[in-house]
């Protein structure tokens, strides 16, 4: 579990207890057995939005 008092990971990422970091859920595409991928299954990835002038 994430350490108490730390901010939750932003959308599209999930906490890795192994690495002590918020990891991009995109990693789970190739490495689905990483510890944080369980958290990714519950949260859809953040959509990427192009910023037009």
């Amino acid at each position: 579990e994430q350490a108490p008092g730390t901010a939750p990971c932003s959308r599209g990422s999930s906490w890795s207890a192994d690495l002590d970091k918020c990891m991009d859920c995109a990693s789970c595409r190739a490495r689905p057995h990483s510890d944080f991928c369980l958290g990714c299954a519950a949260a859809p990835p953040a959509p990427f939005r192009l910023l037009w002038p």
Epitope: C9, S10, G12, S13, S16, D18, L19, K21, C22, M23, D24, C25, A26, S27, R29, A30, R31, H33, S34, D35, P45, A46, P47, F48
Partner: antibody, heavy 125, light 113 residues
Framework: DVQLQESGPGLVKPSQSLSLTCAVY????????WSWIRQFPGNKLEWMGE???????NSNPSLKSRISITVDTSKNQFFLQLNSVTTEDTATYYC???????????????????WGQGTLVTVSA | DIVMSQSPSSLAVSVGEKVTMSCKSR????????????LTWYQQKPGQSPKLLIY???TRESGVPDRFTGSGSGTDFTLTISSVKAEDLAVYYC?????????FGSGTKLEIK
């Protein structure tokens, strides 16, 4: 600083098994993926497979029936076994760590940032 | 498997010149959810192990001189050395890690005139 060192026999007979060890010194072992890559004479590089400290693996389908990658977290070591070798398996074998980098507080795998020095394995009768 | 093609296979330049080399993937290695290209560039000097130069197509690894620049997206990528030094003599490989099996290009050998 993390350092990796490959070890194993430099000569293997055809049809036998090739077994290599990669020892990881310094840094964290958990959470990272640890890879085996080989470089054939002529310099072509081939990713063979990877493992994490939990024993989860990805392997190159071209080797799937012959390759086994295992880990010993108590010793910070991981291992390669390649069965039924032929002269085509003659290569320099490297172990490497898949690095992790962050952008705006979100981290992701970012390429093999630490490599061993490589060990030449010759398959010959 | 995602096939990676590099060109040219070799090139010879003088110290101080600008160099560009190309890497193309058979299919896109851009992941739309985070807009990252899962492409790395490695430098392998004679007798040494490969060294990570660039990841995510354009991010320099810590300690890599800023004369090395990675660019491109989707299927077409470029490594540029703005002003070549003698120590840049090496083979440069691209690699995709968008999906397994992770695959390498055949390399571009940089020679110094």
């Amino acid at each position: 600083d993390v350092q990796l060192q490959e070890s194993g026999p430099g000569l293997v007979k055809p049809s036998q098994s090739l077994s290599l060890t990669c020892a990881v010194y310094g840094g964290s072992f958990s959470g990272y993926y640890w890879s085996w890559i080989r470089q054939f004479p002529g310099n072509k590089l081939e990713w063979m497979g990877e493992i994490n400290h939990r024993g989860s693996t990805n392997s190159n389908p071209s080797l799937k029936s012959r390759i086994s990658i295992t880990v010993d977290t108590s010793k910070n070591q991981f291992f390669l076994q390649l069965n039924s070798v032929t002269t085509e398996d003659t290569a320099t074998y490297y172990c490497a760590r898949e690095g992790i980098s962050g952008s705006m507080g979100i981290y992701d795998y970012s390429g093999m940032d630490v490599w061993g020095q490589g060990t030449l394995v010759t398959v010959s009768a | 498997d995602i096939v990676m093609s590099q060109s040219p296979s070799s090139l010879a330049v003088s110290v101080g010149e600008k160099v560009t080399m190309s890497c193309k993937s058979r299919q896109s290695i851009l992941y739309s959810s985070n807009n990252k290209n899962y492409l790395t560039w490695y430098q392998q000097k004679p007798g040494q192990s490969p060294k990570l130069l660039i990841y995510w197509a354009s991010t320099r690894e810590s300690g890599v001189p800023d004369r090395f620049t990675g660019s491109g997206s989707g299927t077409d990528f470029t490594l540029t050395i703005s002003s070549v030094k003698a120590e840049d003599l090496a083979v440069y490989y691209c690699q995709q890690y968008y999906s397994t099996p992770y695959t390498f290009g055949s390399g571009t050998k940089l020679e110094i005139k």
